[in-house]
Amino acid sequence: SIPWNLERITPPRYRADEYQPPDGGSLVEVYLLDTSIQSDHREIEGRVMVTDFENVPEEDGTRFHRQASKCDSHGTHLAGVVSGRDAGVAKGASMRSLRVLNCQGKGTVSGTLIGLEFIRKSQLVQPVGPLVVLLPLAGGYSRVLNAACQRLARAGVVLVTAAGNFRDDACLYSPASAPEVITVGATNAQDQPVTLGTLGTNFGRCVDLFAPGEDIIGASSDCSTCFVSQSGTSQAAAHVAGIAAMMLSAEPELTLAELRQRLIHFSAKDVINEAWFPEDQRVLTPNLVAALPPSTHGAGWQLFCRTVWSAHSGPTRMATAIARCAPDEELLSCSSFSRSGKRRGERMEAQGGKLVCRAHNAFGGEGVYAIARCCLLPQANCSVHTAPPAEASMGTRVHCHQQGHVLTGCSSHWEVEDLGTHKPPVLRPRGQPNQCVGHREASIHASCCHAPGLECKVKEHGIPAPQGQVTVACEEGWTLTGCSALPGTSHVLGAYAVDNTCVVRSRDVSTTGSTSEEAVTAVAICCRSRHLAQASQELQ
Amino acid sequence: QEDEDGDYEELVLALRSEEDGLAEAPEHGTTATFHRCAKDPWRLPGTYVVVLKEETHLSQSERTARRLQAQAARRGYLTKILHVFHGLLPGFLVKMSGDLLELALKLPHVDYIEEDSSVFAQ
């Protein structure tokens, strides 16, 4: 029967008595930077070309005995998970291996850099189809390793890496912390985060998604027909490298941004038990388990968006946090979140010719996060319209006044330390879908976009008194682009998007002792692209 | 522009015999930074990745590496250039004493220097 991990990543329509999805990634080359591998193992023979690249440190210990099967163990298993005949994800993908880890599974940042440079030079000498680079390794945070990954990604290469097995914030490790890399955490057959001895999978905002990473059956270097079960975020990353190879084989022109958005879009949502993660990391960690798309084509009509969290601002009075989208994504909205509730909102601003989302901490606050909603919107022309604090009037309002521009997100930023002491009336933006409304002492920022066939609508859900969380979701066929709260009182900890749901978090009334007069409303802006839908229908 | 370690003129003469053109002095106002792994057991002191500014050409990388070797030798330190990077990042990998970091950070074109560190199979 089909191994649990292959079943988990396979959409129901492919689930017969065996795993045989269409097109096994035959147009794609997957580079593996790992240990040496047994390339003639029955599971991978003819699928893996061992390059002559080798850059590894000496093994530790004077009595170390170099046993070939042990030296090859990690890399052979991963090559099998990516492209193995019987237990592989992308059975048609061809692979090239570079040895950057020694027989003890240890390498260096410098050796990995030289390996990445080797791949870039090979790509220039002999351009082939799409390239996926699998980095099933981790070290401490490294500026230079992250920079090299960024350069390779900008050269059109898809990099996939292990989040790390340290039961820690993946942002503290490299290449897991590189924003351009697809970083993968590990889950088990019960969709729980994987525990590995006293440690386990890494987590946090630097993880893009999770994938099967416990008891994964794959090629064993113990013999040419042997299989073995291994666990770790390397195994999880190998699944995503295989899925990426299949997606790129079906759509070779996909950019890294498009691929990442599709991986997120087709993932199983909200199946991971978040209680395993430290409390402060739960909101930052994506609840996504990778899966193959239900069909190899036809996803192009969707408006894809993802949520990007910034690093924590830190607690100083003027601290800010910035969340950025990838180069070919559009920032369609910006929100902020603070566990203490002490924040001064957020704003979209230009930085280096691109919009970024900046959140502001407040005096006495423990720090804030900026949350960017990053979307794929071809031929988009977006701008930010700002209204300064209205002071005397009912509230601050701003709308998209340019012809053909629609509202995709609202942000508000204030200088006063605590808006809660300046209670405004609750404002309703009824009848004016292209308008942002906020506190009279806040400046309001509207994200206004023009793109072919783009249409958006506002959805709200309010509850009479703060109860910890208010949510509002976009319906099928619509994509959440903006998420904000009304009003911006001190009750509100912040707003953020989780998949297609806008979540507004607020302090519980019971803990603040406030009156129940104040309602908290979650405001979602839901968009779709008629242009993309029509274009895809014309293709079919 | 004067080289802060006083070796600049002497070195230029040495370089001139090797190749045409004056070796550039470091730009003022931009300070190169040093980075190392926060996890102490994973550090590999003695090997450093010297990363040069983005538009640096291979020839300049090689020249900067030779300059470092020359200045280090003058101070009685042996250095070994293990690899010159080009294609992804401009720079070089050098085996040297940590005592030379201050000197290396003042070299022209240097953006930052990172001490090598371990990575592990996951």
């Epitope: 047994q38 003639d40 029955r42 023979e45 003819g46 040419s224 | -």
Partner: antibody, heavy 115, light 110 residues
Framework: QVQLVQSGAEVKKPGASVKVSCKAS????????ISWVRQAPGQGLEWMGW????????NYAQKVQGRVTMTTDTSTSTVYMELRSLRSDDTAVYYC????????WGQGTTVTVSS | QSALTQPASVSGSPGQSITISCTGT?????????VSWYQQHPGKPPKLMIY???NRPSGVSIRFSGSKSGNTASLTISGLQAEDEADYFC?????????FGGGTKLTVLQ
């Protein structure tokens, strides 16, 4: 192009040994092992075993285990299959083929065991 | 006695389609994606026609196709031609080795 070239025909007496060679060329040797398959006159194919060019590891079929030895000489890209204690029912055409997938075959070596 | 069962012979006229079956168990055909089919003309070595159940090596006519259901694999040859007359063998992985079928003699009726 990918080629497997085998040694010439052999006639052996029962109890003797035979050593057949197979020289590989035209591909990355370490990406595939070599399988040995035999075919008795008018019969089907029988898989005898496999050897790795990468590390010399072997995998023998149970039926010939103990009588067969496969070796490699990486310097000449050649694989050898030695069969000992020959019997008359070992009379067959012996083929080498690339890997477990057996996508490329040698031309075959006829081994006749006769007293 | 071969591990995989094939019909001893099949025949068909030029232009027709024929199918050769290859039956094993869940420990071979049913358990692996690696069923291959070989064509062998008299006095010649076998030639790979289908690998991994349904894949065709380059140079093999599209008239040859393979499939698998449960523990049985099948080779279908459409638009029979005189040169298709040969012996056909299936093979499959087992946990530690390889097994072949006994072979099927295909006769193209003239």
């Amino acid at each position: 192009q990918v080629q497997l070239v085998q040694s010439g025909a052999e006639v052996k007496k029962p109890g003797a040994s035979v050593k057949v060679s197979c020289k590989a060329s035209g591909y990355t040797l370490t990406s595939y092992g070599i399988s040995w398959v035999r075919q008795a006159p008018g019969q089907g194919l029988e898989w005898m075993g496999w050897i790795s060019f990468y590390n010399g590891n072997t995998n023998y079929a149970q039926k010939v285990q103990g009588r067969v030895t496969m070796t490699t000489d990486t310097s000449t890209s050649t694989v050898y299959m030695e069969l000992r204690s020959l019997r008359s029912d070992d009379t067959a055409v012996y083929y080498c083929a690339r890997g477990y997938g057996m996508d490329v075959w040698g031309q075959g070596t006829t081994v006749t065991v006769s007293s | 006695q071969s591990a995989l069962t094939q019909p001893a012979s099949v025949s068909g006229s030029p232009g027709q389609s024929i199918t050769i079956s290859c039956t094993g168990t869940s420990s071979d055909v049913g358990g692996y994606n690696s069923v291959s089919w070989y064509q062998q003309h008299p006095g010649k070595p076998p030639k790979l026609m289908i690998y991994e159940v349904s894949n065709r090596p380059s140079g093999v006519s599209i008239r040859f196709s393979g499939s698998k259901s449960g523990n049985t694999a099948s080779l279908t040859i459409s638009g029979l031609q005189a040169e298709d007359e040969a012996d056909y063998f299936c093979s499959s992985y087992t946990s530690t080795s390889m097994v072949f079928g006994g072979g099927t003699k295909l006769t193209v009726l003239q």
